[in-house]
Interface confidence: low
Amino acid sequence: IVLRPSRVHNSEENTMRALTLKDILNGTFSYKTFFPNWISGQEYLHQSADNNIVLYNIETGQSYTILSNRTMKSVNASNYGLSPDRQFVYLESDYSKLWRYSYTATYYIYDLSNGEFVRGNELPRPIQYLCWSPVGSKLAYVYQNNIYLKQRPGDPPFQITFNGRENKIFNGIPDWVYEEEMLATKYALWWSPNGKFLAYAEFNDTDIPVIAYSYYGDEQYPRTINIPYPKAGAKNPVVRIFIIDTTYPAYVGPQEVPVPAMIASSDYYFSWLTWVTDERVCLQWLKRVQNVSVLSICDFREDWQTWDCPKTQEHIEESRTGWAGGFFVSTPVFSYDAISYYKIFSDKDGYKHIHYIKDTVENAIQITSGKWEAINIFRVTQDSLFYSSNEFEEYPGRRNIYRISIGSYPPSKKCVTCHLRKERCQYYTASFSDYAKYYALVCYGPGIPISTLHDGRTDQEIKILEENKELENALKNIQLPKEEIKKLEVDEITLWYKMILPPQFDRSKKYPLLIQVYGGPCSQSVRSVFAVNWISYLASKEGMVIALVDGRGTAFQGDKLLYAVYRKLGVYEVEDQITAVRKFIEMGFIDEKRIAIWGWSYGGYVSSLALASGTGLFKCGIAVAPVSSWEYYASVYTERFMGLPTKDDNLEHYKNSTVMARAEYFRNVDYLLIHGTADDNVHFQNSAQIAKALVNAQVDFQAMWYSDQNHGLSGLSTNHLYTHMTHFLKQCFSLSD
């Protein structure tokens, strides 16, 4: 059982109240985390509650304000960035969101030495991306899809690229599909460690089909949004990587980095770039059929002023049972010799583990092993490697931080977090200062989140950075639901589940059950984290039991479970939710006549297929922004798991796995279909096609659209959405309003 925040039990039960929907919509019980903005081994910046930018020195214990809230307010700044030489700060304002990571903004440069904004050669607006060099105060920025360089903030800019064109050529920033499905960043440029070189990607979207949808706005005529968006099987962006010498940018100009021959022979992707030294860079490439990845280490040739990527420095990673990597192919963490590296990939038993690669992948030395998975390498120093895993006590939904002392042989391993606040904290991430001199631990639960600062040598806790005291006090009179994380063993498959139970749960009674599902490949829903959200309210106030189940296709439990869904999405994910529901019914406290399922995005797809499974298990269900056919979704994501929608590849399963193909099966369930009309990610087209199929089959259903809303359904739409879904479920479960 996962323990929720401890509270003083008051003998007067009436002082305790249930959660309300208003609590959730107002974010009354949201928590804070503290991630230091490290600027050296022992210093970090933090934006104080009153918006001053404060520099903290851990070793002297001193802190001082480097930038006042008055200066921030003078340009309505919402973000900042200190130059590494500490002479300048950029201030970011006029934030305007584009896609998941991307946004444009206006940037002002403040000179700390004279306390004034830099005048002359001001930056254009709006800028798509801006960053300091890692040393000094050079600036690189992207404006109108072209990259510019400034040697100093007050200098005139040097234009690096000239071919940038909206929706056609992207320099230094990704196009839609690379941003969402490959890089997971708003940028596609990378400074070398000392700022000598700048690497960048160029994406050519000229031949990509365009998704067009109406944005209604307030005008007489709606606008049309056009996005080059390659759906499964469509023409993909063409990517090239260039590197320019930033000291003498005009000398030879940008030099293209060659693509490995085995990759260039057919459609391919660039997946990431990692600088090793100022004159060595590592690029990762991926075949369009995403089971072969190549890591290529390239060196600068002074004599030719070019980048050389010898075949002997190409490392191939191939999957024979699924796709390469987990959600993404992992990135390397280089050691101090600047050629060997640490990387997470599947071992011979099919578990993702840390390997040390010195010459070839075949000769890799396995650093971690076991029937659990290494999840992230945080930092490698000369004597330690810090990583996270779900090894401890065999709970896949936990994250603990470990240190391996690589300076000694054999390397010894120690869990840094396993016994810190053990009941409260079982899911950690970490943030390290230079050379891992100090680090912050951020614990996400299952108790109230807490952020702490630690000595990197002894692991001693130095201080609490954020403990969410206000939240703890606010929850003292709240009847929170109980949470259990357990597992079901079914036909040699382990199904971990989280069950959220009403506060006065009584096993002898019968409760309505709501399944919340995501279920996408390499996802994980059953995690030991704290949350007070909509489903907490449904359990606390409305007396529902809510369950989340990680079935086949989910992550961090080995390749057998993960790759089970390869080339057949929409089958086992649904089967496993159904299997779990049957097991929950056997537990005796579920009202079989009141079972619902809901999900968003991939979860909307799974919930729709579960409702249309013909099992008769579900009375009703909700799909928010569902995928309805894999032919409608992005190439990079879809083809990773499904291959191509061609006759000689996997077209048959693309056709068999649609929601529309099961329209008839919705006849005996109550179905609520919800979608935003301006969804750039899972296009409204998906729900439009479900609705059309249901109408054609003369099946009744309920629907709600959110005009001009994207995949996140944010702002006032969120309130409307959850209120609407609550009414729907209460009606389905015959609960009074």
Epitope: S405, S412, K413, K414, H419, R457, Q460
Partner: antibody, heavy 120, light 108 residues
């Protein structure tokens, strides 16, 4: 020389209480995890309780949970063990010990021990 | 909790002989194992930590080896002051810190 000196032991009736102290000298006390280890007459070593440098975490062996409380005062370089509801089986020599710094946590400095006798 | 089993329970040897003491862990503990020496009426003294690293001022006739579940303390040539009880201790997964039952090395 790094030293640990325990005090506070003695004869006590079952159900009674005692408070042991351990005074540390010549090392940065606050940086180190400290533990109490006991040894019943003619028996082996048994770890009883531990406390982290900043007192953030306290640890106990199952048999003393709820009865014993470990604490420390870093300003006084002193470690304490408050023992309540004492039983005959708590009779032992109690040692305080300093742990090494990460990653080993072996106990590199021990006090000379203080004797606790629980008898009616 | 991790259980440490020491063998043999006691060992009768003459000065100058080699002593080999064994410690087995109920589950793998990497090299998070220490060895202590205790003489009658005295507090334990740290000999070895990290399975094989000698503590400060410990003579080189004491050596430790092993990793995982099997560990050995070797005293290459017993001196009269080495006759004592030896304990192994794990700190891989704690709390609780656990000790082995001890091996008594006595004069033959």
């Amino acid at each position: 020389d790094v030293q640990l000196v325990e005090s506070g032991g003695g004869l006590v009736h079952p159900g009674g209480s005692l408070r042991l102290s351990c005074a540390a000298s010549t090392f940065t006390f606050a940086n180190y995890i400290m533990s109490w280890v006991r040894q019943a007459p003619g028996k082996g070593l048994e770890w009883v309780s531990g406390i982290t440098g900043s007192s953030t975490n306290t640890y106990y062996t199952d048999s003393v949970k709820g009865r014993f409380t470990i604490s420390r005062d870093n300003s006084k370089n002193t470690l304490y063990l408050e023992m309540n509801s004492l039983r005959a089986e708590d009779t032992a020599v109690y040692y305080c010990a300093k742990h090494q710094l990460y990653p080993y946590y072996a106990m590199d400095v021990w006090g000379q021990g203080t004797t606790v006798t629980v008898s009616s | 909790e991790i259980v440490l089993t020491q063998s043999p329970g006691s060992l009768s040897l003459s000065p100058g002989e080699r002593a080999t003491l064994s410690c087995r862990a109920s589950q793998p503990i990497d090299s998070y194992l220490a060895w202590y020496q205790q003489k009658p009426g005295q507090a334990p003294r740290l000999l070895i930590y990290g399975a094989s690293t000698r503590a400060t001022d410990i003579p080189d006739r004491f050596s430790g080896s092993g990793s995982g579940t099997e560990f050995t303390l070797t005293i290459s040539s017993l001196q009269s002051e080495d006759f004592a009880v030896y304990y192994c201790q794990q700190y891989y997964d704690w709390p609780p810190v656990t000790f082995g039952g001890g091996t008594k090395v006595e004069i033959k």
